[in-house]
């Protein structure tokens, strides 16, 4: 069979949640492989995911070094088999990704309600402080460690017997709300970064209701 040309990658897309960051692209390779490079605006181009037939590359280890930096990636297409390189002067084809700033753009993962505790007519609801892959001094930081007061949580709560929802907000991971004595309530939380223009909100957490296992009740 005759030779074909290498094809440049296209549809380069960042997929990132809580800083776990993967670059995806097309097409599935035929007689070619890919190598990804990543750089900050002022840094070196670092090769990752060498000579791969995958169409994704996990770049988490690179972006967590400084989540406030802006990153650019590029995907090189290398001939591997009965193909010809279409780059000029032996240079391989490559395609650039959109710019990506993790702090501003990573999706907020679905939060989890860790616990709730009722004392009389007050309920304390605690949101799990999810661990990220961002490190400082060899320990992994939580979402709150990374975002600080930029991150708030919205609590949606309602009586099990009705559909009318109330909301509360906190810039910590805890809510203290007033409830009617003798009523069971259900809760759901959402992570929000109000200062953002994109990816401001997470999906809602799974609903947790009083009278189920996560709660503690004290008169």
């Amino acid at each position: 069979s005759g030779t074909t040309n290498t094809v440049a990658a296209y549809n380069l897309t960042w997929k990132s949640t809580n800083f776990k960051t993967i670059l995806e692209w097309e097409p599935k390779p035929v007689n070619q492989v890919y190598t990804v490079q990543i750089s900050t605006k002022s840094g070196d181009w670092k090769s990752k995911c060498f000579y791969t037939t995958d169409t994704e590359c996990d770049l988490t280890d690179e972006i967590v070094k400084d989540v406030k930096q802006t990153y650019l990636a590029r995907v090189f297409s290398y001939p591997a088999g009965n193909v010809e390189s279409t780059g000029s002067a032996g240079e391989p084809l490559y395609e650039n990704s959109p710019e990506f700033t993790p702090y501003l753009e990573t999706n907020l993962g679905q939060p989890t309600i860790q616990s709730f505790e009722q004392v009389g007519t007050k309920v304390n609801v605690t949101v799990e402080d999810e661990r990220t892959l961002v490190r400082r001094n060899n320990t992994f930081l939580s979402l709150r460690d990374v975002f600080g007061k930029d991150l708030i949580y919205t609590l949606y709560y309602w009586k099990s017997s009705s559909s009318g929802k109330k909301t509360a907000k906190t810039n910590t991971n805890e809510f203290l709300i007033d409830v009617d004595k003798g009523e069971n309530y259900c809760f759901s939380v959402q992570a929000v970064i109000p200062s953002r223009t994109v990816n401001r909100k997470s999906t809602d957490s799974p609903v947790e209701c009083m009278g189920q296992e996560k709660g503690e009740f004290r008169e």
Partner: antibody, heavy 117, light 106 residues
């Protein structure tokens, strides 16, 4: 012109330590991964691992994990391969080679290490 | 790790003859290089990406293969072709070399 210049031949006794070097010039040293390859006398090539000079990330062949250490000094564009306690079986030619795509192919001239009592 | 087995270990041929060098991988490989090494010299990239000739490599050389079986072919041996040839896979870490094939003058 891209050049990789390695340090000279070494003769050592078992148990001694050693650090051999590979100095890069004619290119941005921090931008390219640097490979190390071993060739024992009369034998084939073995990939030991590689290091990225900008941040010292290493990819090491597990076979060499407890035997040798890769490091760099960015300020003098030099990569190092070192041993804390040499064995007779470390006797070999060691090459550094810049990680490149395709026809780009830059190797050091090799450093001969002889370990003998 | 992926083990590369080269055969034959030694190929004794005369100038003008055709040489066929094989490299068999223990699991599928998508990116294979070949290196030439002459006595007292560092290895040189000879074929990259299975079938692409490195700069300055004569057209009498060719590379082919896929999956686990790869071949370097020299259509008509010239005196300067007598050397050791190594295959190397870069599909998965650790990158590995074959044991080499020595092409010697018969």
């Amino acid at each position: 012109e891209v050049q990789l210049v390695q340090s000279g031949a070494e003769v050592k006794k078992p148990g001694e330590s050693l650090k051999i070097s590979c100095k890069g010039s004619g290119y941005s040293f921090t931008s390219y991964w640097m490979n190390w390859v071993r060739q024992m006398p009369g034998k084939g090539l073995e990939w030991m691992g590689m290091i990225y000079p900008a941040d010292s990330e290493t990819r090491l062949n597990q076979k060499f994990k407890d035997k040798a250490t890769l490091s760099v000094d960015k300020s003098i564009s030099t990569a190092y391969l070192q041993w804390s306690s040499l064995k007779a079986s470390d006797t070999a030619m060691y090459y550094c080679a810049r990680e490149d795509y395709g026809s780009s192919d830059y190797w050091g001239q090799g450093t001969t290490v002889t370990v003998s009592s | 790790e992926i083990v590369l087995t080269q055969s034959p270990a030694t190929l004794s041929l005369s100038p003008g003859e055709r040489a066929t060098l094989s490299c068999s991988a223990s699991s599928s490989v998508s990116y294979m290089n070949w290196y030439q090494q002459k006595p007292g010299q560092s290895p040189r990239i000879w074929i990259y990406g299975i079938s692409n000739l490195a700069s300055g490599v004569p057209a009498r050389f060719s590379g082919s293969g896929s999956g686990t079986d790869f071949t370097l072919t020299i259509s008509s041996l010239e005196p300067e072709d007598f050397a050791v040839y190594y295959c190397q896979q870069k599909s998965s870490f650790p990158w590995t070399f074959g044991g080499g094939t020595k092409v010697e003058i018969k």
